[in-house]
Amino acid sequence: MAVTACQGLGFVVSLIGIAGIIAATCMDQWSTQDLYNNPVTAVFNYQGLWRSCVRESSGFTECRGYFTLLGLPAMLQAVRALMIVGIVLGAIGLLVSIFALKCIRIGSMEDSAKANMTLTSGIMFIVSGLCAIAGVSVFANMLVTNFWMSTANMYTGMGGMVQTVQTRYTFGAALFVGWVAGGLTLIGGVMMCIACRGLAPEETNYKAVSYHASGHSVAYKPGGFKASTGFGSNTKNKKIYDGGARTEDEVQSYPSKHDYV
């Protein structure tokens, strides 16, 4: 039950996170004109990854796409790439996790396969979230650098007859949406990875036999039971020190430790 809840919650959190990453990527307000000391200009400028917008005081807004690819700063291209990779990985992760959900039955899919898929989607969500956080952070760093550069330019002597007022840009709403969304996707991914451990079936190679050694309460189980995560083939028999002799059925009737994670 706990596993199903963790997996379901992980899926929902990741879904919200990826929707947020998509929203942030599409938003125009990655950087907005700094209005700290009263607006210097009668127009408000804000920029996204794909276009730049100008809003006049009347409310009239006009946006222009960045129609060049080669003329754009490398950092902007890098941020675009990170966000797109994040979206693609997240989307694939969502698709995989839908089939991995314990509450959804697809044919005779084994728990080991579901565990596999849950872990895969979890890793995808983690990488997706990291990509979004990295993309947003790179852009934020770029803004901070440019902000202080333009502030320095404002206070240095301006030569020549024609002066230009530096427009400074600060963090736009999209950055905060991106950070939160990236964080949610990351959390969702971690939850999926945790759920994966609980999904792994507890298998036995063969019936365990209990030997009662005189004066000692030690059960030697030649076959032991292996906790298979469903990844790789672990055929080695392990001796299990149990601190007391029990039948295999007794041992297996106890809840798996993974159910409580």
């Epitope: 127009v43 400028n45 100008v54 009347s58």
Partner: antibody, heavy 120, light 113 residues
Framework: QVQLKQSGAELVRPGASVSLSCKTS????????IHWVKQRSGQGLEWIGR????????YYNENFEGKATLTADRSSSTAYMQLSSLKSDDSAVYFC?????????????WGQGTSVTVSS | DIVMTQSPSSLTVTTGEKVTLSCKSS????????????LTWYQQKSGQPPELLIY???TRESGVPDRFTGSGSGTDFTLTVSSVQAEDLAVYYC?????????FGGGTKLEIK
């Protein structure tokens, strides 16, 4: 059609205050900025400030800070400008104007102007 | 404040003549975000309020005759009247519509011979 009708000419004493009105019609009053412009006799135009009736936000030219106060009455779609501590160099024609939508902050409609004469 | 300088201060022309009025700003009025220049031209006839002629440096207001053309970018702007008519007798003002406070040029008085 859009109209801005200003109050009549004013003759005031130095040190006194005066309130000029600008009654608007033909458009949604709360959705457009109202600007006020000063023109001294035979001289150029000077921007005083602007007021947004929708939110009550005002921006002033520093030269008129403390001199002009912009307000509006939404129920009657009327904008007001109060001029205080009047001096002789406040004698001028004052225009109220509307900022157009999608016209680069330009003023597309103007009132006929109110003449203010400061004299003892 | 942005200084708007208009030249000449007055101009006498004959009807049908082409006339060019100049306006220079102390700072660039070009907005890089939308590639528009926030400069406006007004016409003020004697005893009347000013009238909007051109905004965004080159966009003609509706109802304005097409003999009026605005051009220029950055800091240098011109208003061209291709064929002056008697009714064009007026004072022409340019205005910075970008930086606060909005500032007007001193005006160019167009007189007809």
């Amino acid at each position: 059609q859009v109209q801005l009708k200003q109050s009549g000419a004013e003759l005031v004493r130095p040190g006194a205050s005066v309130s000029l009105s600008c009654k608007t019609s033909g458009y949604i009053f709360t959705s457009y900025w109202i600007h006020w412009v000063k023109q001294r006799s035979g001289q150029g135009l000077e921007w005083i400030g602007r007021f947004y009736p929708g939110t009550g936000t005002a921006y002033y030219n520093e030269n008129f800070e403390g001199k002009a106060t912009l307000t509006a009455d939404r129920s009657s779609s009327t904008a007001y400008m109060q001029l205080s501590s009047l001096k002789s160099d406040d004698s001028a024609v004052y225009f109220c104007t509307r900022e157009g939508y999608g016209k680069g902050n330009a003023m597309d409609y103007w009132g006929q102007g109110t003449s203010v004469t400061v004299s003892s | 404040d942005i200084v708007m300088t208009q030249s000449p201060s007055s101009l006498t022309v004959t009807t049908g003549e082409k006339v060019t009025l100049s306006c220079k700003s102390s700072q660039s009025l070009l907005q890089s975000g939308n590639q528009k220049n926030y400069l406006t031209w007004y016409q003020q006839k004697s005893g009347q309020p000013p009238e909007l002629l051109i905004y965004w440096a080159s966009t003609r207001e509706s109802g304005v005759p097409d003999r009026f053309t605005g051009s220029g970018s950055g800091t240098d702007f011109t208003l061209t009247v291709s064929s002056v008519q008697a009714e064009d007798l007026a004072v022409y003002y340019c205005q910075n519509d970008y930086y606060f406070p909005f500032t007007f040029g001193g005006g160019t008085k167009l007189e007809i011979k």
